[in-house]
């Protein structure tokens, strides 16, 4: 689920935007895989990647830059 797409009906929260990261619909959704931007308190959470927020679980999640792995993209992928 590391890939993200733009969606025109997302209230301005568009995947790929540096500030917003991933799409969040205006209506509350409980399905897994529904993301919004991370709270700004997590701006340094992802070491080598970008942060997105799992809405249903209220948890941050990292989408790692190429060549990095780990929950916070903190490790170099030796197999990359």
């Amino acid at each position: 689920d590391g890939n993200s797409t733009r969606s025109p009906e997302t209230n301005g929260l568009l995947c790929g935007d540096p500030e917003e990261n991933c799409a969040a619909t205006t209506t509350q959704s409980k399905r897994k895989g529904h993301f919004s931007r991370c709270p700004k308190q997590y701006k340094h959470y992802c070491i080598k990647g970008r942060c997105r927020f799992v809405v249903a679980e209220q948890t941050p999640s990292c989408v790692c830059d190429e060549g990095y792995i780990g929950a916070r993209c903190e490790r170099v992928d030796l197999f990359y």
Epitope: P39, Q41, Y42, V55, Q58, T59, P60, R72
Partner: antibody, heavy 121, light 107 residues
Framework: QVQLVQSGAEVKKPGSSVKVSCKAS????????ISWVRQAPGQGLEWMGG????????VYAQKFQGRVTITADESTSTAYMELSSLRSEDTAVYYC??????????????WGQGTLVTVSS | DIQMTQSPSSLSASVGDRVTITCRAS??????LNWYQQKPGKAPKLLIY???NLQSGVPSRFSGSGSGTDFTLTISSLQPEDFATYYC?????????FGQGTKVEIK
Amino acid sequence: QVQLVQSGAEVKKPGSSVKVSCKASGGTFSSYAISWVRQAPGQGLEWMGGIVPWMGEAVYAQKFQGRVTITADESTSTAYMELSSLRSEDTAVYYCARSSSTYGIHAFDYWGQGTLVTVSS
Amino acid sequence: DIQMTQSPSSLSASVGDRVTITCRASQSISNFLNWYQQKPGKAPKLLIYAASNLQSGVPSRFSGSGSGTDFTLTISSLQPEDFATYYCQQYDDFPMTFGQGTKVEIK
């Protein structure tokens, strides 16, 4: 059931320090963020700072930076808030509050009973 | 810091009334907002988290809505035990900040 039990009321002189404790039971203490929130008589709620699990350290509101220290002792499941250079405006009820998140500071779902700190000469 | 402004600061209502409290953030906070109820001499109690999610054990007459900068707490039918002070709180960024509170009194 999570419970946060705070230490008793304190009366302090201006210029002195106070250390309030908050003992947790019924949950995994080290997993959650503990914050301290104060409330002056007849006033609203004011976040002072808190320990952020993913950072492994405390973050403080600028207003209290340099005057407040928030620590935790995992062996006793107790959090502490020490406020120094006390002045009369610091007279307030001090609450510890647990964040609902094991990552950062989100909603405060459990609160201590409050500790009244009175600063008076 | 993100400023949170509640309105009204106080209101008088009767049992059975529909009550609406608003909270405005000084900048967009997405839906990173919580609502609390506080009674005199007691610690605050979490009612709503993430703008619209009802905390476990909280009566369904409480509801929250909004995103961005404007948020609303609604009590659909005010009960005697609902007379209290209500606070909003943002958790988008440090420092966490609260609204100044809205006191709901008996008319």
